[in-house]
């Protein structure tokens, strides 16, 4: 959590932003809020982002103001037009990119002060992890697949039976180019797998951690996963 | 006030280079994008490409990629744009030109004259 | 990248001539639209910029006004010292594109 205090002269607003990672080819939603004002007209929010010349979105007098947008995010950006006289200036990005990444101002004047707070903004790919068992192979195995990643991540096996195993060497895992050459298909397969276990497949990289459960019995297939981003902190 | 000042008048052979220089003052040079229009002789305007003088950055036009460089010196508040492999076609005034979206000063221009 | 045409490419008119000149482009480029004054051996100056913004300093019988692919510019008096050639550019996308020119002159 980033706190920012406004700039002396006037009198000083506090806004509050929240680091974040955005899914490239998806949106994302950079997090700022800021001490109310009761009037909406009183209102002016610029969006910044480091080594961008232009503005990455500007709301003033109750609406966007867009002569001075920076042309990487023409059509791409929003706010949460209904909310700002609440205090939420976030910021909605369509279509992340991998370039969007970088640090951002969230920048507000009310007729109460002013104030400012950066945030960290890192872009990637991340998906959630789906194990299945591989009937095709000769031996017990499980095959670990999620669509899109990026960076590289590392998947490392789990097993609640063999708890602190190491399964590097009975696993193996690769990586495929997705069409558009940024993201990765993750596919990673564990080979002896016992009955009456359940086994966990985690993938990680520096924004997001995501695993993938499976309970094997003689009697059903249990499967579970969740997805979790690194790295969210407020300022 | 905002001031672009240009280098002066410049005579080339087919083949060889010129740098033109673009020196800004009245205003915080690593602020505002700075990009370079040509102008041929009795013809329109034509973007080559723009350079972030924060971070050195650069965008250009298809048409110039490989042959045209541009730089600053944040030192100076100066940039400067290169264009290599002169031919005739590119006689021209060269203009440095601040701001992103629209160029709202403009230096005074450079005329290159690509002769044998 | 976005082509810009500008019509008329010549205009003569008097004095005190209301006179518009228009800009289209081949895809919709959201107001990102400038105007632009050039006299015979000078920089073009900004008159108008995001469609209809005068820039500072620009006389207000200059205005603009349109939207998606269709854009005007307006003297709504002509003066002796408006005689010149008029550019309109695109700023919605790089590279920018600008139209080829409008020369206005005395009729």
């Known amino acids: 959590l980033i706190i920012g205090f406004g700039i002396s002269g006037r009198h000083s607003i506090t806004v509050t932003t929240v680091a974040s990672a955005g899914n490239i080819g998806e949106d994302g939603i950079l997090s700022c809020t800021f001490e109310p004002d009761i009037k909406l007209s009183d209102i002016v929010i610029q969006w910044l982002k480091e080594g961008v010349l232009g503005l990455v979105h500007e709301f003033k007098e109750g609406k966007d103001e867009l002569s001075e947008q920076d042309e990487m995010f023409r059509g791409r950006t929003a706010v949460f037009a209904d909310q700002v006289i609440v205090g939420n200036a976030s910021l909605r990005l369509k279509n992340v990119q991998l370039t969007d990444a970088g640090t951002y101002k969230c920048y507000i004047i009310t007729s109460k002060g002013k104030g400012n707070a950066n945030l960290e903004y890192k872009t990637g790919a991340f998906s959630m992890p789906e194990v299945n068992v591989d009937y095709n192979a000769s031996s017990e195995t499980l095959r670990c697949e999620a669509p899109r990643w990026f960076p590289q991540p590392t998947v490392v096996w789990a097993s609640q039976v063999d708890q602190g195993a190491n399964f590097s060497e009975v696993s193996n895992t690769s990586f495929e180019l997705n069409s558009e050459n940024v993201t990765m298909k993750v596919v990673s397969v564990l080979y002896n797998v016992t009955i009456n276990n359940t086994y966990s497949c985690m993938i990680e990289n520096d924004i997001a951690k995501a695993t993938g459960d499976i309970k094997v019995t003689e009697s059903e297939i249990k499967r579970r996963s969740h997805l979790q981003l690194l790295n969210s902190k407020a300022s | 006030q905002v001031q672009l000042v240009q280098s002066g008048a410049e005579v080339k052979k087919p083949g060889a280079s010129v740098k033109v220089s673009c020196k800004a003052s009245?205003?915080?040079?690593?602020?505002?994008?700075m990009n370079w229009v040509r102008q041929a002789p009795g013809q329109g305007l034509e973007w080559m490409g723009r350079?972030?003088?924060?971070?050195?950055?650069?965008n250009y036009a298809q048409k110039f990629q490989g042959r045209v460089t541009l730089t600053v010196d944040t030192s100076t508040s100066t940039a400067y744009m290169e264009l290599s492999s002169l031919r005739s076609e590119d006689t021209a005034v060269y203009y440095c030109?601040?701001?992103?979206?629209?160029?709202?000063?403009w230096g005074q221009g450079t005329t290159v004259t690509v002769s044998s | 990248d976005i082509q810009m045409t500008q019509s008329p490419s010549s205009l003569s008119a008097s004095v005190g001539d209301r006179v518009t000149i228009t800009c289209r482009a081949s895809q919709d480029i959201s107001n990102y639209l400038n105007w632009y004054q050039q006299k015979p051996g000078k920089a073009p100056k900004l008159l108008i910029y995001?469609?209809?913004r005068l820039h500072s300093g620009v006389p207000s019988r200059f205005s603009g006004s349109g939207s998606g692919t269709d854009y005007t510019l307006t003297i709504s008096s002509l003066q002796p010292e408006d005689f010149a050639t008029y550019f309109c550019?695109?700023?919605?996308?790089?590279?920018?594109?600008f139209g080829q020119g409008t020369k206005l002159e005395i009729k």
């Open positions: 030109a601040r701001r992103h979206n629209y160029a709202d000063f």
């Open positions: 550019q695109q700023g919605q996308t790089l590279p920018w594109t």
């Open positions: 350079v972030n003088p924060a971070n050195g950055g650069t």
């Open positions: 995001y469609t209809s």
């Open positions: 009245g205003y915080t040079f690593t602020d505002y994008y």
